[in-house]
């Protein structure tokens, strides 16, 4: 018996087609993805093949103005229209709290939404009961297939699930649910979830009875043969893991942003064992036409977005200096504003010992593309912010050693004075440079804000300590020459859309007045500093 699994993950509000790098589509003839194009391909496969499942491994939420405006209603509407068969909860599904998941998505989805390792407690337990499930048995042709879901255990640090949801260890939570399905004579089981490729592989290895793992969170691109676009494969598709009980378990993921449709064909024997598996992600490029009815629906929903982008979010009573003359040479107040918003967006009081789990932010000055003038009645709109942050990136959470951070700050000024983008703006960090010293040895003081403290204060950076830092995905991926971050990071979790983070902060504060306040100091002659 043959099953075709079509899968997406980490779509992050890319409902409309995008450019090749998943940012805003400029030249339509070269654009990719989007739900209208996805639907064309899915329907083509459904017509051609008998047993097809369309699955999503989480993180539909967050990423473009679509989510900012529609808050998940767009996800339910268009996933229903595409007739998804099941979805796993990702960490970003909790970005607007549990209510922001229940009302727009859980109550509206016509497909099961799954996670076996999220347990509700207290008053939430009855409210959310039955709205998401640990597993669902689906009819496929004349057979049945069990789909069991899982979600990153790190979600409380990455999103806003509140205090009444407990995120258990994935493997510990999955095993009894899979055992239950086996007891119920369901012999074909797919684990569908959102914990990253390393955990996907562990699930394939450790959870007895799982036949296939369909994952997300790490934006992993797998491919067999010559890849069709810019993404470099992390391994073959499917990636085969040998389980502890000796079975070959295919593991798949389909990059992100709806650029590809994962396509996996599995052959089962009559006892539900996988005999063979093969496939590849399908690049959703312009050779695949956009479905006209879905496209018309997208255009209808789009209208509200254009109205939103010109509405006032809040006011500034100071000039927001985002000029390259400032942000690539010294501390600029636009950089301070953005970093403050980044930290504010990551306030998660999950431990009594810590005032917050993260206190530090770095931001490449080259990523700040425009100032905002306060002489326009002080008004700040989404449109204004889109000029400051036009690249459609995310502000991510990484864990780094102090030594890596020190290297990053040396890189920040290694060729100072040439208006290059790597000059870092900061939050929760005090840095002093001596620009008369030779490149690679210019950081003379680097103090960072404590997290394990009731009164935050600045302490010298410790080389061997592991720190959490919020930064643009561009830097986490080694952009602007920050190879040391990419190479040495200990953990990387993708975060919220950059513009969304700043717009939420401005809306929350109502009136802003960021200052230049001595976070970054530089001098060109020798002072008698103790070298840290």
């Amino acid at each position: 018996w043959e099953l075709t699994i079509l899968h997406t993950n980490d779509v992050h509000s890319r409902l409309e087609q995008t450019s090749e790098d998943s940012s805003k589509c400029v030249n339509a003839s070269r654009c990719m993805g989007g739900v209208a194009r996805l639907f064309t391909k899915v329907q083509q496969i459904r017509r051609a093949e008998p047993n097809v499942l369309l699955l999503d491994a989480g993180d539909q939420y967050q990423g473009t103005i679509w989510f900012t405006v529609y808050k998940g209603a767009e996800v339910a509407h268009f996933m229903n229209a595409l007739r998804y068969d099941a979805m796993a909860l990702g960490n970003h599904e909790f970005d607007n709290g549990v209510e922001g998941l229940i009302e727009p998505l859980l109550k509206e989805a016509k497909f099961p939404i799954l996670s076996a390792n999220i347990k509700a407690k207290g008053p939430l337990a009855s409210q959310i009961s039955g709205l998401y499930l640990p597993y669902k048995v689906l009819p496929v042709g004349d057979e049945v297939v069990g789909i069991v879901g899982y979600t990153s255990k790190e979600t409380p640090f990455l999103s806003n699930p509140g205090t009444n949801l407990v995120f258990e260890d994935e493997i510990t939570a999955l095993q009894p649910e899979v055992d239950k399905l086996k007891t119920l004579n369901v012999n074909k089981i797919i684990a569908l979830g959102h914990s990253g490729f390393e955990m996907d592989k562990l699930i394939a290895q450790k959870v007895r009875g799982v036949d296939v793992v369909v994952g997300g969170h790490s934006n992993t691109f797998l491919y067999t043969g010559n890849p069709p676009s810019k993404e470099v494969p992390a391994g073959k598709y499917p990636f085969i893991v040998t389980s502890d009980d000796g079975r070959k378990v295919p593991v798949v993921q389909a990059y992100a942003f709806g650029k590809y449709l994962g396509y996996l064909k599995i052959e089962f024997d009559e006892r539900g064992n996988v005999i063979s598996s093969h496939g590849n992600p399908i690049l959703l490029n312009s050779s695949i036409p956009e479905d006209p009815s879905i496209k018309a629906d997208i255009n209808k929903w789009r209208i509200k977005l254009d109205n939103y982008s010109t509405q006032e979010l809040g006011k500034t009573i100071v000039y927001l200096d985002g000029s390259s003359q400032s942000c690539r040479f010294r501390e600029c107040n636009m950089g301070n504003l953005i970093c403050d918003a980044m930290i504010n967006n990551n306030l998660r009081h999950t431990d009594e010992m810590f005032w917050n789990h993260v206190s530090m932010c770095i931001l490449n000055g080259g990523g700040i593309r425009s100032p905002i003038d306060e002489r326009n009645n002080g008004t700040i709109t989404w449109e204004n912010l889109a000029a400051v942050l036009p690249f459609g990136g995310t502000f991510d959470l990484v864990q780094l050693k102090g030594s890596t951070l020190k290297k990053a700050f040396e890189h920040s000024v290694h060729r100072y004075g040439q208006s290059t983008g790597e000059f870092l703006q900061v939050g929760g960090i005090h840095v002093v440079y001596d620009l008369s010293r030779k490149p690679g040895d210019r950081v003379v003081k680097l103090d960072v804000l404590c997290t394990k403290c009731r009164v935050p204060s600045y302490d010298p950076l410790k080389m061997d300590e592991v720190y959490k830092v919020i930064l643009p995905n561009f830097l986490a991926n080694g952009g602007d020459g920050f190879q040391m971050i990419k190479d040495e990071l200990l953990r990387h979790d993708s975060g919220d859309q950059d513009i969304n983070v700043v717009s939420t902060y401005i809306s929350k504060m109502k009136v802003i007045y960021p200052a230049v306040e001595g976070r970054i100091k530089a001098h060109h002659h020798h002072h008698h500093h103790h070298h840290h």
């Epitope: 099961p112 499930l133 597993y135 689906l138």
Partner: nanobody
Framework: QRQLVESGGGLVQPGGSLRLSCAAS????????IGWFRQAPGKEREGVSC????????YYADSVKGRFTISRDNSKNTVYLQMGSLRAEDTAVYYC?????????????????????WGQGTLVTVSS
């Protein structure tokens, strides 16, 4: 082979009663949410009543509330639908369906999601 077999259908006068049975072979109904659905000629299939395996909670469509009663006998691996005060509009093919997923009885009956196991159906005709 897993099977759901409905029985008890037939011709009945308006105001009369019938008891439908759904017998399961090949699986234990204790772990399943069971539903009775019906489809009248030229109409969509609709959920009539559902019962859970765990806490025996039940759900009834508004059109049958107070007239129909769903029950289960796990020792016999059978679910029943006692139908009273029958009307002409109750005429339909009645199907039994089962889902081992932990869906609510309401979600099962709507049905919100595809249901994996179905019987062949039994015809109920209400006519004078």
């Amino acid at each position: 082979q897993r099977q759901l077999v409905e029985s008890g259908g037939g011709l009945v006068q308006p105001g009369g009663s019938l008891r439908l049975s759904c017998a399961a072979s090949g699986f234990l109904l204790d772990y399943y949410v069971i539903g009775w659905f019906r489809q009248a000629p030229g109409k969509e299939r609709e959920g009539v009543s559902c019962i859970s395996g765990s806490d025996r909670s039940t759900y009834y469509a508004d059109s049958v509330k107070g007239r129909f009663t769903i029950s289960r006998d796990n020792s016999k691996n059978t679910v029943y639908l006692q139908m009273g005060s029958l009307r002409a509009e109750d005429t339909a093919v009645y199907y039994c369906a089962a889902d081992p997923s932990p869906v609510t009885v309401q979600a099962m009956c709507l049905p919100r999601f595809p249901v994996p196991y179905w019987g062949q159906g039994t015809l109920v005709t209400v006519s004078s």
